[in-house]
Interface confidence: medium
């Protein structure tokens, strides 16, 4: 740099502001250097010396140019229903998102504070609106001529098969049973699955408990006196 170039700190002109990446120190009444991301102000500037910056310690960070005396603490480790999508470094906070089969019931500035398992639609109900990263599954009763015989957060109502001769008529939770050797037309013989909507980045997918198991206790939100949503299991 040229020999005569002035370095911070310097006194700004009256009515002027400090340059970008500098801040005005009220005590010194000087424009001083900010610390870069991953650092914090170890010693504030004076009229004759610039800000002294130091690296953030383990498990702390600063994301912006700053003059804070201490780095911010990274958030706590991700819970079992979450996946760490961004690690804690000197320049960024840890970010936790919900694992597949769960959605974010309580978000924070970045990532999720509280995950909840996606609602499962019980037999006789199908998925009307799939779950997203931040919203639960919406179930609806299967309309006449359709059925769902599964407890699932992805299965939609499927049309009954059409028989030449009906042995047992279908209902909302069961397909029609035909007497002839084969139906004239079968609509979607297998279960129709919607794509898993949440946190597909994770490779650590764990199977969601089936309704025959005990209700999950890994997530407890005060529900108040209202009953579970119609067509959903108690999960």
């Amino acid at each position: 740099l040229p020999a005569q170039v002035a370095f911070t700190p310097y006194a700004p002109e009256p009515g002027s502001t400090c340059r970008l990446r500098e801040y005005y120190d009220q005590t010194a009444q000087m424009c001083c250097s900010k610390c870069s991301p991953g650092q914090h102000a170890k010693v504030f500037c004076t009229k004759t010396s610039d800000t002294v910056c130091d690296s953030c310690e383990d498990s702390t960070y600063t994301q912006l140019w700053n003059w804070v005396p201490e780095c911010l603490s990274c958030g706590s480790r991700c819970s079992s229903d979450q996946v760490e999508t961004q690690a804690c470094t000197r320049e960024q906070n840890r970010i936790c998102t919900c694992r597949p089969g769960w959605y974010c019931a309580l978000s924070k500035q970045e990532g999720c504070r509280l995950c909840a398992p996606l609602r499962k639609c019980r037999p006789g109900f199908g998925v009307a609106r799939p779950g997203t990263e931040t919203s639960d599954v919406v179930c609806k009763p299967c309309a006449p001529g359709t059925f769902s015989n599964t407890t699932s957060s992805t299965d939609i109502c499927r049309p009954h098969q059409i028989c030449n001769v009906v042995a047992i008529p279908g209902n909302a939770s069961m397909d029609a049973v035909c007497t002839s050797t084969s139906p004239t037309r079968s609509m979607a013989p297998g279960a129709v699955h919607l794509p898993q909507p949440v946190s597909t980045r994770s490779q650590h997918t764990q199977p969601t408990p089936e309704p025959s198991t005990a209700p999950s206790t890994s997530f407890l939100l005060p529900m108040g006196p209202s009953p579970p949503a119609e067509g959903s299991t108690g999960d």
């Epitope: 040229p2 370095f7 700004p12 970008l20 140019w65």
Partner: antibody
Framework: QVQLQQSGAEVVRPGASVTLSCKAS????????MHWVKQTPVHGLEWIGA????????AYNQKFKDKARVTADKSSSTAYMELRSLTSEDSAVYYC????????????????WGQGTTLTVSS | DIVMTQSQKFMSTSVGDRVSVTCKAS??????VAWYQQKPGQSPKVMIY???YRYSGAPDRFTGSGSGTDFTLTVNNVQSEDLAEYFC?????????FGGGTKLEIE
């Protein structure tokens, strides 16, 4: 090599708004401040304001603080300047220019300039 | 705001001559001054920074001098390609300000 590619000429009606863009290439966009300069035959070169793309921090010439708003998108290495409530006085060539500003020093000059965007405000 | 005054709007010179363009600041700006060259239809180009340091892309016939309030850009052995307008600029403090420009005309 460093290049600043500005959007094409604009002809707009008085009272309208316009957004000019400046796409940077050939260097790390967030490492350098981006400044905007207005040029007219009457007033010559006038500094409008600046943005630090790394932080989004901005600085403005008081004369333009209600007229201009500068932003930057790191993902596309593009700086933008919105000009509001346009009048014939805003007809000019607008340049984006990179500031060399050495961190921690007063050294600060414009080493690369865009080709300029001509703005015409006319009814 | 700091006012940068280039009192001569036009200067006439001949190829091979030496010419000096002056700029006066309304208050002390130290050496926080740059000089720019702008050819017709082109963007400005930096020639001098920190009052006296030649930018890497500028020919060595361009020199800068001065500090405080009075600054000079000198072009030695003027060439026809030096036909342009020259602007001084202070970067001591926001808002950065430019001089009104001096047009160099080749006789």
């Amino acid at each position: 090599q460093v290049q600043l590619q500005q959007s094409g000429a604009e002809v707009v009606r008085p009272g309208a708004s316009v957004t000019l863009s400046c796409k940077a290439s050939g260097y790390t966009f967030s490492d350098y401040e981006m400044h905007w300069v207005k040029q007219t035959p009457v007033h010559g070169l006038e500094w409008i304001g600046a943005i630090d793309p790394e932080t989004g921090d901005t600085a403005y010439n008081q004369k333009f603080k209600d007229k201009a708003r500068v932003t930057a998108d790191k993902s596309s290495s593009t700086a933008y300047m919105e000009l509001r409530s346009l009048t014939s006085e805003d007809s000019a060539v607008y340049y984006c220019t990179r500031d060399i500003h050495y961190y921690g020093s007063s050294l600060s000059y414009f080493d690369y300039w865009g080709q300029g965007t001509t703005l015409t405000v006319s009814s | 705001d700091i006012v940068m005054t280039q009192s001569q709007k036009f200067m006439s010179t001949s190829v091979g001559d030496r010419v000096s363009v002056t700029c006066k600041a309304s208050q002390n700006v130290g050496t926080n001054v740059a000089w720019y060259q702008q050819k017709p239809g082109q963007s400005p180009k930096v020639m001098i920074y920190s009052a006296s340091y030649r930018y890497s892309g500028a020919p060595d016939r361009f020199t800068g001098s001065g500090s405080g309030t009075d600054f000079t850009l000198t072009v030695n052995n003027v060439q026809s390609e030096d036909l342009a307008e020259y602007f001084c600029q202070q970067y001591k403090t926001y808002p950065y300000t430019f001089g009104g420009g001096t047009k160099l005309e080749i006789e």
